[in-house]
């Protein structure tokens, strides 16, 4: 999906009002400097591409993020404020339902959400170019 035409300010507002709190809640108990920042993004569409990938694509050691509160709110924000996003996700959602697993917060998931916090932080930068 090409995130170029999203309403970035509306997505930013959704992040600031709710998603950020849900990320904080998920990370509760984690040490501030436990994880290095290794994932980056250069502009807002790129940030959303990386955010979507880390939030919804299962990775080795962390298959359970998509059902977390922050993930569901992220999905809703993208569906509302990114034209055509919902349609591109129908197949992905059906595939995800087939491999749904019990929610387990692993250290790998915490590391992944730490990277997500960094990506959202970059997405929210006021001077970050959109293209």
């Amino acid at each position: 999906y090409d995130f170029t035409n999203c309403d970035f300010e509306k997505i930013k507002a959704a992040y600031l009002s709710t998603i950020s709190k849900d990320l904080i809640t998920y990370m509760s108990g984690t040490k501030s400097t436990e994880f290095n920042n290794t994932v980056s993004c250069s502009n807002r569409p790129h940030c959303l591409t990386e955010i979507q990938s880390l939030t919804f694509n299962p990775t080795a050691g962390c298959a359970s993020l998509a059902k977390e509160m922050f993930a569901m709110k992220t999905k809703a924000a993208l569906a509302i404020w990114c034209p055509g996003y919902s349609e591109t996700q129908i197949n992905a959602t059906q595939a995800m339902k087939k491999r749904r697993k019990r929610k387990v917060t692993t250290n790998k998931c915490l590391e992944q959400v730490s990277q997500l916090q960094g990506l959202w932080r970059r997405f929210n930068r006021p001077l970050l170019k959109q293209q």
Partner: antibody, heavy 118, light 107 residues
Framework: QVQLVQSGAEVKKPGASVKVSCKAS????????MHWVRQAPGQRLEWMGE????????DYNQNFRGRVTITVDMSASTAYMELSSLRSEDTAVYYC???????????WGQGTLVTVSS | DIQMTQSPSFLSASVGDRVTITCKAS??????VAWYQQKPGKAPKLLIY???MRHTGVPSRFSGSGSGTEFTLTISSLQPEDFATYYC?????????FGQGTKLEIK
Amino acid sequence: QVQLVQSGAEVKKPGASVKVSCKASGYTFTSYLMHWVRQAPGQRLEWMGEIDPSDSYTDYNQNFRGRVTITVDMSASTAYMELSSLRSEDTAVYYCALTGTINYFDYWGQGTLVTVSS
Amino acid sequence: DIQMTQSPSFLSASVGDRVTITCKASQDVVTAVAWYQQKPGKAPKLLIYWASMRHTGVPSRFSGSGSGTEFTLTISSLQPEDFATYYCQQYSSFTFTFGQGTKLEIK
């Protein structure tokens, strides 16, 4: 182990600028955010701003925006905080402090006293 | 900005006493609260993060609790080295803010 070593005390005239340095060691400099926090005599701690050394992006407390500039010298693993248009109320101890993506401060510099007096 | 209000501002106590310091946030900060101890001429030292987690090396007599808008720091049995100023800080949202401090003095 992580260490943050700051430059020495400064005395400045009102209207002048001051630049405080913070040399980091014991970790990969680009991995974490560097913050500056100040404490005026008898006052609460006040967060001033932060810099991401990986790309030098800064965020500032609006109370200081326009007067504070935070920079880094990657080659020296050093962060700087410059405060301009100094006034007597800027007399304070200035600290650098380190965080990851979660913004509480588990590592602090020793502090730099800046005195603004005519 | 979220305001953090500590009480009391001053507290006199004796060695062996149990003391509690309170911090109230002006809006919900989940559990994103840290507590610091500061002695004269020194940088603050992290005691508690995530409202209730003790930082490495912090004695077990220090404990934190709370969520939402009300938080407490408790020292179960005061030791001579505990007389200092204590600050709470919220890191739930930008800009990060501190309480005004509680100065703990020997009675």
